[in-house]
């Protein structure tokens, strides 16, 4: 169950989609990454609130556990929901290869 | 790639599957739900320290990124990987029902 | 619309050379990375080259590495494939084709025959 | 490089039939599959990416699953202009490369 979408802390308080400008050395690829030299990486950024986007059945009980025991239990955890393709040109033993990556880009964010 | 299981933070500091007892009324589901009792809720909770137990790509993304710049990227994050079915014996509007639900119960964790 | 026109069709002999053209519209050329595709007369497709938008990154299936060399001209518009010592297998119907950036072909040309005989 | 195994070769359809062929990649793709058909004369078009989504205006009747190395096509009640080649291409990684094809043709 994807619950609410209104955030109570404000706009933009709550977990959503963000966008990190990071270049090949920011993320430790310089040495087997040729390109994009820089990449825009989409991740999940923000609180999770009771019942914000709730990603399932265990993010409900999460909450519940929290507000209970908030300093032996979590809050729910901003994380991907699903991911967009990236293709990496990168370095290989033999030269050169395009490689399709399925987990570099967050397309869309829940709580968990 | 779920990478290094050893925590450099010391035994049982880092992400790993943990036990919580919950109540009915603990969960908010008195009105709803009859049985069990009581729910031996698995949750995954603890630090994700660098490469500890890294979903993926993105895990080891933001990492970087948070190592980089932590007040705008948040470190990785312990949240299930996988999850345990637990049936409940629920009341419905004609008397009650046995619903099997897939993801109450983490399984095991890692760091996302 | 999106339209690329493959040119250069032709019969070569065996060692022979032949360069192929591709005229792309309706979409911003620069920005998309190309590859050509062949069907051969067995009606099986093959992967032949693939160029980044600028030019700077090119792979080729190793049945025509060294003998073919993919170009692009941004201002122009175009694509090329230069085909050189030319074999009888690489026979086929050649088709254009733009890459949105996941290695998958959404758009195709209509294709060039290309026919290597003695 | 990744082999695509294609099969069968030949499907033969009546029209309202539900159909699938597979395609098995010789190492782990994810779910980088690619499905087109193409039609005599015709340039091959693309239907499916993501070994599931369904390209702009393919009609649902088409749909793709599978990930790893196991992939299905299927249509679900096929129509006369239907009948065509199907290849399924993995972009995973270069080479890319394709399934030998699947001809569907009328009983």
């Known amino acids: 169950a994807r619950n609410g979408d209104h955030c109570p802390l404000g706009p933009g308080r709550c977990c959503r989609l963000h966008t990190v400008r990071a270049s090949l050395e920011d993320l430790g690829w310089a040495d087997w990454v040729l390109s994009p030299r820089e990449v825009q990486v989409t991740m999940c950024i923000g609180a999770c609130p009771s019942q914000f986007r709730a990603a399932n059945m265990h993010a409900q009980i999460k909450t519940s556990l929290h507000r209970l025991k908030p300093d032996t239990v979590p809050a729910p955890c901003c994380v991907p929901a699903s991911y967009n393709p990236m293709v990496l040109i990168q370095k290989t033993d033999t030269g050169v290869s395009l490689q399709t990556y399925d987990d570099l880009l967050a397309k869309d964010c829940h709580c968990i | 790639a779920r990478n290094g299981d050893h925590c450099p933070l010391g035994p049982g500091r880092c992400c790993r599957l943990h036990t919580v007892r919950a109540s009915l009324e603990d969960l908010g589901w008195a009105d709803w739900v009859l049985s069990p009792r009581e729910v031996q809720v698995t949750m995954c909770i603890g630090a994700c320290p660098s490469q500890f137990r890294a979903a993926n790509m993105h895990a080891q993304i933001k990492t970087s990124l948070h190592r980089l710049k932590p007040d705008t990227v948040p470190a990785p994050c312990c949240v299930p990987a996988s999850y345990n079915p637990m049936v409940l014996i629920q009341k419905t509007d004609t008397g009650v029902s046995l619903q099997t639900y897939d993801d109450l119960l983490a399984k095991d964790c890692h760091c996302i | 619309d999106v339209k690329l026109v493959e040119s250069g069709e032709g019969l070569v002999k065996p060692g022979g050379s032949l360069k192929l053209s591709c005229a792309a519209s309706?979409?911003?050329?620069?920005?998309?990375?190309m590859s050509w595709v062949r069907q051969t007369p067995e009606k099986r497709l093959e992967w032949v080259a693939y160029?980044?938008?600028?030019?700077?990154?090119?792979f080729y299936a190793d049945t025509v590495k060294g003998r073919f060399t993919i170009s692009r001209d941004n201002a122009r518009n175009t694509l090329y494939l230069q085909m050189s010592s030319l074999k009888s297998e690489d026979t086929a119907m050649y088709y254009c084709?733009?890459?949105?950036?996941?290695?998958?072909?959404?758009?195709w040309g209509q294709g060039t025959l290309v026919t290597v005989s003695a | 490089s990744i082999v695509m195994t294609q099969t069968p070769k030949f499907l033969p359809v009546s029209a309202g039939d539900r159909v699938t062929m597979t395609c098995k990649a010789s190492q782990n793709v994810g779910n980088n599959v690619a499905w087109y058909q193409q039609k005599p004369g015709q340039s091959p078009k693309l239907l499916i990416y993501?070994?599931?989504n369904r390209y702009t205006g393919v009609p649902d009747r088409f749909t793709g699953s599978g990930s790893g190395t196991d992939f299905t096509f299927t249509i679900s009640s096929v129509q006369v202009e239907d009948l065509a080649v199907y290849f399924c291409q993995q972009h995973y990684s270069s080479p890319l490369t394709f399934g030998a094809g699947t001809k569907l043709e009328l009983k």
């Open positions: 309706g979409f911003t050329f620069s920005s998309f990375a």
């Open positions: 084709t733009r890459d949105d950036g996941y290695l998958w072909f959404a758009y």
């Open positions: 993501y070994a599931s």
């Open positions: 160029i980044t938008s600028g030019g700077d990154y090119i």
